[in-house]
Amino acid sequence: ASHSGMINPSRQWQTLKQNTGVAHFEYQIRVTCDDYYYGFGCNKFCRPRDDFFGHYACDQNGNKTCMEGWMGPECNRAICRQGCSPKHGSCKLPGDCRCQYGWQGLYCD
């Protein structure tokens, strides 16, 4: 027995039925992507990381989900202390607020 057609990657099992006239076949099949690959063509990659290149986990669709305190397309930009002046303060670590020269205070304001 052979099956021809598209089967999209899924965690679900699909039941295929075939009647050849001589015998009746019923079988279950599923196609899964390799580890860290996602999408219909398994052509999206996401592997959690927490280093210079980014700080993220992956959702069930392979989208990057930033760890707490991080943002940006690669989750490599720190979210500064709430209230930190966007003009006079900045941070490289989450919750931080480093002041520009000449500015001070908890929020560099």
Epitope: Y37, F45, R47, F52, F53, G54, P73, E74, N76, K92
Partner: antibody, heavy 116, light 107 residues
């Protein structure tokens, strides 16, 4: 469309420094890191380092540590690579490239010739 | 540093041939591997990233496979424009080293 345009060819004497620029356009400059790669005549590709364009933090290959400086000017969306104490072995084409998952975009290359 | 061993260093083949280039890494890099094609006087061109994802616009005769330490680039049926030098590169950790290259020549 995404473009990386590099500065022109340079001829330098041994011991001198060279600064190559890479002007980006067609995307948000601070969203992607810039890498520098070089290729000596008839040789393979050699990764030199990466700069985080948002923070200006850089990481260099051990071989170039102490001799290379990578910087960015976010106001002009330009990355710079400066190599000091040049020697004849530094004669190469220097490329800037963009990316996190491999380099889909490259500059056209800058030939740096070191000769006395 | 992660070492990249690419083989063969050169290869002669004919139009229509199936060609395989391999890249071996000194440690597990999962799927953080990229393949490039470079023609003389030009910047490299991205073919495959994350070991097996074809970049947009790259013909389907190119394919990549492998994970961990062993990777393969396959060209299913060589075309005249495929004669070039091919490089692998890992992008797992710093430094992002390249393989030594494979020069693909016309037989």
């Amino acid at each position: 469309q995404v473009q990386l345009v590099q500065s022109g060819a340079e001829v330098k004497k041994p011991g001198a420094s060279v600064k190559v620029s890479c002007k980006a356009s067609g995307y948000t400059f601070t969203d992607y890191a810039i890498h520098w790669v070089r290729q000596a005549p008839g040789q393979g590709l050699e990764w030199m380092g990466i700069i985080n364009t948002y923070y200006g933090d850089s990481k260099y290959a051990q071989k170039f540590q102490g001799r290379v400086t990578m910087t960015v000017d976010t106001s002009t969306s330009t990355a710079y690579m400066e190599l000091s104490s040049l020697r004849s072995e530094d004669t190469a084409v220097y490329y800037c490239a963009r990316g996190y998952d491999g380099f889909a975009y490259w500059g056209q290359g800058t030939l740096v010739t070191v000769s006395s | 540093d992660i070492q990249m061993t690419q083989s063969p260093s050169s290869l002669s083949a004919s139009v229509g041939d199936r060609v395989t280039i391999t890249c071996r890494t000194s440690e597990n890099i999962y799927s953080y591997l990229t393949w490039y094609q470079q023609k003389p006087g030009k910047a490299p061109k991205l073919l495959i990233y994350h070991a097996k994802i074809l970049d947009s616009g790259v013909p389907s005769r190119f394919s990549g496979s492998g994970s961990g330490t062993d990777f393969t680039l396959t060209i299913s049926s060589l075309q005249p424009e495929d004669f070039a030098t091919y490089y692998c590169q890992h992008h797992y950790d710093i430094p992002w080293t390249f393989g030594g290259g494979t020069k693909l020549e016309i037989k």
